[in-house]
């Protein structure tokens, strides 16, 4: 569900939302760490309806959700929660 990308692109998010998105509507979450042309961390939610939402990294719901997913990934065997793609 969570993906961390390191890119050399500028910031991708123009507008950010803090509104809670239920997990059943989410396809995947892409995390873009700050640096490489963008001064801030960006979180992009790809939804099952094919739309894309930039989420404010400070939004309480996304922080809580990522914490849950991190805990789950460290305590279960299947696929890791973070998939790192390094160019």
């Amino acid at each position: 569900v969570l993906e961390v990308y390191y890119t050399s692109l500028r910031c991708r998010c123009v507008q950010e939302s803090s509104v809670f998105i239920p997990r059943r509507f989410i396809d995947r979450i892409q995390i873009l760490p700050r640096g490489n042309g963008c001064p801030r961390k960006e979180i992009i939610v790809w939804k099952k309806n094919k739309s894309i939402v930039c989420v404010d990294p400070q939004a309480e719901w996304i922080q809580r959700m990522m914490e849950v997913l991190r805990k789950r990934s460290s305590s279960t065997l299947p696929v890791p929660v973070f998939k790192r793609k390094i160019p």
């Epitope: 509104v19 809670f20 239920p22 059943r24 309806n49 719901w61 809580r64």
Partner: antibody, heavy 120, light 107 residues
């Protein structure tokens, strides 16, 4: 203007069947999840179930999934609730609602409700 | 299933009063909570989503707060047209569940 117009309610005998309809206008119906919610006389709201835009995911309240079937026809902008083997406790006002998955993620538009009475 | 325990079940208040309703989830629902207003014989109306966001056109006297398991709905200054039953709902996960409702009356 968004409108959800419901029909199909009425009196049905215990053990019988009924199909409720919800016709949508003013929205791109085929893009949205839709839900059914019911309310027994003098009681609170109870979620019945929901269906995603292409009908590939349908979630039900566990106590109802064996008797109730939710479906939709995007070509007709319509949502349906097929009720089988009805019981007295299914007597309620049934509402259809849009389950928004673009901006609010809650039920932002509701039908006017249709009354189902189960009695012999 | 996630239970939503709403209190009080009924409430009598005067015009201009501050009214508070609480909702407690049986497990963590993040901020996946909505609040609805229902008047007799009418369909519910969405007031608050994502625990604290006012829906389009909803007056500023209505507000919500909370996360995790504890949520609060507030009417800062009760108006005669606010007489209704109010419901919390969790939409964090299915089956979606509602609180039992709070019937608000004018003193």
């Amino acid at each position: 203007e968004v409108q959800l117009v419901q029909s199909g309610g009425g009196l049905v005998q215990p053990g019988g069947s009924l199909r409720l309809s919800c016709a949508a206008s003013g929205i791109d119906f085929s893009r949205y999840w839709m839900s059914w919610v019911r309310q027994a006389p003098g009681k609170g709201l109870e979620w019945v179930g929901e269906i995603n835009p292409d009908s590939s995911t349908i979630n039900y309240a566990p106590s109802l999934k064996d008797r109730f079937t939710i479906s939709r026809d995007n070509a007709k902008n319509s949502l349906y609730l097929q009720m089988n083997s009805v019981r007295a406790e299914d007597t309620a006002v049934y509402y259809c609602a849009r389950q928004d998955d673009y901006e609010y993620y809650a039920m932002d538009y509701w039908g006017q409700g249709t009354t189902v009475t189960v009695s012999s | 299933d996630i239970q939503m325990t709403q209190s009080p079940s009924s409430l009598s208040a005067s015009v201009g009063d501050r009214v508070t309703i609480t909702c407690k989830a049986s497990q963590d629902v993040n901020t996946g909570v909505a609040w609805y207003q229902q008047k007799p014989g009418k369909a519910p109306k969405l007031l608050i989503y994502s625990a604290s966001y006012r829906y389009t056109g909803v007056p500023s006297r209505f507000s919500g707060s909370g996360s995790g398991t504890d949520f609060t709905f507030t009417i800062s200054s009760l108006q005669p047209e606010d007489i209704a039953t109010y419901y919390c709902q969790q939409y964090y996960s299915t089956p979606l569940t509602f609180g039992g409702g709070t019937k608000l009356e004018i003193k």
